[in-house]
């Protein structure tokens, strides 16, 4: 064996955004014939020696960063990429609006605005069908998400969440959906 064992993958099914009290399964996947899996919750000292963690009802305490590794013989693999498991529905939903409006011409500009009654400093915007949040490289965490030079690919259903940087894995419920129409 030359070099460390390759890292496994860690995924949350059906999603890493989990409404409170809903089920989720974390699955660590390495190569065939693994002797031992270790799944750990970072910053909590917790671990389990299983590839699969089934959570029947999501709780606030289970939100956070997870990582897994596997052992073959006496060798340990590199760790998986960290998985951020987020509990949603912890706070009331924000409202999502489009300025100047939800119908925009191709090539035009639109700004999606996420607003909340709470003093949250973090916001995440998701487009239905995309696993990762929409992040403007410099200002994604703000309440405004400018989309410059809109194309047909931007059309779809959007939702936003609000949360605090002090508890980055405890999110609001999703906003009501906003349909962006590109003409």
């Amino acid at each position: 064996q030359s070099g460390p064992l390759p890292k496994p993958s860690l995924q949350a099914l059906p999603s890493s955004l989990v409404p409170l009290e809903k089920p989720v399964t974390l699955r660590c996947q390495g190569p065939p014939g693994v002797d031992l899996y270790r799944l750990e919750k970072l910053s909590s000292s917790r671990y389990q020696d299983q590839a699969v963690l089934f959570i029947p009802a999501m709780k606030r305490s289970l939100a956070g960063r997870y990582r897994c590794s596997y052992q073959n013989g006496s060798l340990w693999s590199l760790p998986s990429d960290q998985l951020e498991l987020v509990a949603t529905g912890v706070f009331a939903k924000p409202s999502l609006s489009a300025q100047p409006g939800p119908a925009v011409s191709s090539g035009g500009d639109v700004t999606l605005q996420c607003q909340t009654r709470y003093g949250f400093d973090q916001f995440a915007l998701y487009k239905e069908g995309d696993p990762a949040p929409y992040k403007n490289p410099e200002r994604w965490y703000r309440a405004s998400f400018p989309i410059i030079t809109v194309t047909a690919a931007h059309s779809g259903t959007y939702r936003c969440y609000s949360f605090s940087s002090r508890d980055p894995y405890l999110w609001s419920a999703p906003s009501d959906p906003l349909e962006l129409v590109v003409t």
């Epitope: 970072l42 909590s44 000292s45 671990y47 389990q48 020696d49 590794s69």
Partner: antibody, heavy 123, light 112 residues
Framework: QVQLVESGGGLVKPGGSLRLSCAAS????????VSWIRQAPGKGLEWVSA????????QYAESVKGRFTISRDNAKNSLYLQMNSLRAEDTAVYYC????????????????WGQGTLVTVSS | QSVLTQPPSVSGAPGQRVTISCTGS?????????VHWYQQLPGTAPKLLIY???NRPSGVPDRFSGSKSGTSASLAITGLQAEDEADYYC???????????FGGGTKLTVLG
């Protein structure tokens, strides 16, 4: 209440072997990870080896790998450390320690320790 | 050579506050692993003092507190008492080979 009692220590010549035991009581032994941790005279603590509840998950410090073997007998609530090819630097008090556990999770710290058994390797 | 680095000794007068540092690296404390502290009174086995960086087991006085930041941690003892004279060890976990790691220990002397 939780109790861990080590035994089997003694004087052994370099290259010799020794088997340490740790008798556990007051908890459901087979549900817990347990470790051996040693302390050379006047020195600090050094983790030696750990074993999972079923006995299938085992880990060793680099300093003892290939020479020491950890095992357990859950029916007898006992933990063992078979030490072969002993060296002078293995001289230490050997403690067995239980890892904290809660629900399905094990934790990376030790909530109960035995009083230790002294192993002296000398010619 | 211990994986985690502690000062060999600290001292303080009764009633004073002392702190003990514990420095690790990006593969242990900095890799998201918590720090735990043990107290070893002379001639006895170690006893869990602080777990999960800052939590006290029942029976441990609130004069003992812990914190963690980045790749290091510290243990603070306020209102120092003669019975606090002991060796103190920090402990964490290391991601490389999934081994448990300790600091070299710090001898606390209560003066006077």
């Amino acid at each position: 209440q939780v109790q861990l009692v080590e035994s089997g220590g003694g004087l052994v010549k370099p290259g010799g072997s020794l088997r340490l035991s740790c008798a556990a009581s007051g908890f459901s032994f087979g549900d817990y990870y347990v470790s051996w941790i040693r302390q050379a005279p006047g020195k600090g603590l050094e983790w030696v080896s750990a074993i999972g509840g079923s006995g299938s998950a085992v880990q060793y410090a680099e300093s003892v790998k290939g020479r020491f073997t950890i095992s357990r007998d859950n029916a007898k609530n006992s933990l063992y450390l078979q030490m072969n090819s002993l060296r002078a630097e293995d001289t230490a008090v050997y403690y067995c320690a239980r890892h904290y556990r809660e629900f399905r999770w094990h934790y990376y710290y030790f909530d109960y320790w035995g009083q230790g058994t002294l192993v002296t390797v000398s010619s | 050579q211990s994986v985690l680095t502690q000062p060999p000794s600290v001292s303080g007068a009764p009633g004073q506050r002392v702190t003990i540092s514990c420095t690790g690296s990006s593969s242990n404390i900095g890799a998201g692993y918590d720090v735990h502290w043990y107290q070893q009174l002379p001639g006895t086995a170690p006893k869990l003092l602080i777990y999960g960086n800052s939590n006290r087991p029942s029976g441990v006085p609130d004069r003992f507190s812990g914190s963690k930041s980045g790749t290091s941690a510290s243990l603070a003892i306020t209102g120092l008492q003669a019975e606090d004279e002991a060796d103190y060890y920090c402990q964490s976990h290391d991601l490389g080979a999934h081994v448990w790691v300790f600091g070299g220990g710090t001898k606390l002397t209560v003066l006077g």
